[in-house]
Interface confidence: low
């Protein structure tokens, strides 16, 4: 399946944190979300086999890439207490 | 450069197992994903899977399910390839391929070794 | 899976000669073919992929052309080092496939 690490973070406003996915074997997609209590379930942004093919609701502050693996990095900067969320990946073929 | 450099030629038995190598060099190994593929004599080339260099987690084409397994050495830059129970119609040369730049569609092999014969026989 | 057939399945020509090889996917592919020569012992080369871009340091005399299901690789000018077997492939969908080859002989 599609592994996220890390599990829980925990760090102060305005730090910057990277989160990692690895996409299940053989998927070439790769989708971030993030769910916040207030905001609800938002798409950020999607890969597909290092390209960016969309791009949602994300942040000047936050950014992305994926790699030539496939895995991908999410890159949360100069964070504020309205980040605090849970950080979804997908992955699809 | 780039160069992906394979084990020598193997002669095996029916039912033995072999391991095949392939070192990289000339790029960050764990950048890009390791594909392997088979090429029977006289016949073409069959795409048997790869193995995520970054994570270990290899994919298997349908038909390269069971008896073929995918790994690494990473310290060492190099991809692996085992056939257990070798069959006679495992008799084929084995080739690695580095897959090409991101943003690129698809699967797709810029780098390849230069292969390397297994043949089974009694 | 895809299929892909190539014709002819050899070819004999001459230095200089301009030859041509099709291969033809059994659905489309829109633009995503590559194209590879293979020699005995060498690593196998990327030609050309995305159907007509020239992989960095391939000689401008290989061409590629196509969409959909019918590509062509046409080489303008026969060089003496270009006598090998060339195989298409479709990066267009999940798993890649081959064609089975064509080989050019020198005639």
């Known amino acids: 399946g599609v592994t996220q690490t890390p599990k829980h973070l925990i760090t102060a406003t305005g730090q910057r944190v990277t989160l990692r996915c690895s996409p299940r074997s053989g998927d070439l997609s790769v989708y971030w979300y993030q769910q916040s209590l207030d905001q609800g379930l938002q798409f950020l942004i999607h890969y597909y086999n290092g390209e960016e093919r969309a791009k949602g609701n994300i942040l000047e502050r936050f950014s992305a890439q994926q790699f030539p693996d496939l895995h991908s990095e999410l890159n949360l900067s100069s964070l504020e207490l309205g980040d605090s969320a849970l950080y979804f990946c997908a992955s699809s073929v | 450069q780039v160069q992906l450099v394979q084990s020598g030629p193997e002669l095996k038995k029916p039912g033995e197992s072999v391991k095949v190598s392939c070192k990289a060099s000339?790029?960050?190994?764990?950048?890009?994903?390791v594909h392997w593929v088979r090429q029977a004599p006289g016949k073409g080339l069959e795409w048997m899977g790869w193995?995520?260099?970054?994570?270990?987690?290899?994919t298997y084409a349908d038909d390269f399910e069971g008896r073929f397994v995918f790994s690494l050495d990473t310290s060492a830059s190099t991809a692996n390839l085992q056939i257990c129970s070798l069959k006679n119609e495992d008799t084929a040369t084995y080739y690695c391929?580095?897959?090409?730049?991101?943003?690129?569609?698809?699967?797709?092999?810029?780098?390849w070794g230069q292969g390397t014969l297994v043949t089974v026989s009694s | 899976d895809i299929q892909m057939t190539q014709s002819p399945y050899s070819l004999s020509a001459s230095v200089g000669d301009r030859v041509t090889i099709t291969c033809k996917a059994s659905?489309?592919?829109?633009?995503?073919l590559a194209w590879f020569q293979q020699k005995p012992g060498k690593p196998n080369k990327l030609l050309i992929y995305?159907?007509?871009t020239l992989q960095s340091g391939v000689p401008s005399r290989f061409s590629g052309s196509g969409s959909g299901t019918d590509f062509t690789l046409t080489i303008s000018s026969l060089e003496p080092e270009d006598f090998a077997t060339y195989y298409c492939?479709?990066?267009?969908?999940?798993?890649?496939?081959f064609g089975q080859g064509t080989k050019l002989e020198i005639k």
């Open positions: 391929a580095r897959s090409w730049r991101r943003g690129l569609r698809g699967i797709g092999f810029d780098y």
């Open positions: 000339g790029y960050t190994f764990t950048d890009y994903l």
């Open positions: 193995i995520n260099t970054y994570t270990g987690t290899p």
């Open positions: 659905k489309s592919i829109n633009k995503y």
């Open positions: 995305d159907g007509s």
């Open positions: 492939q479709q990066h267009n969908e999940y798993p890649p496939t």
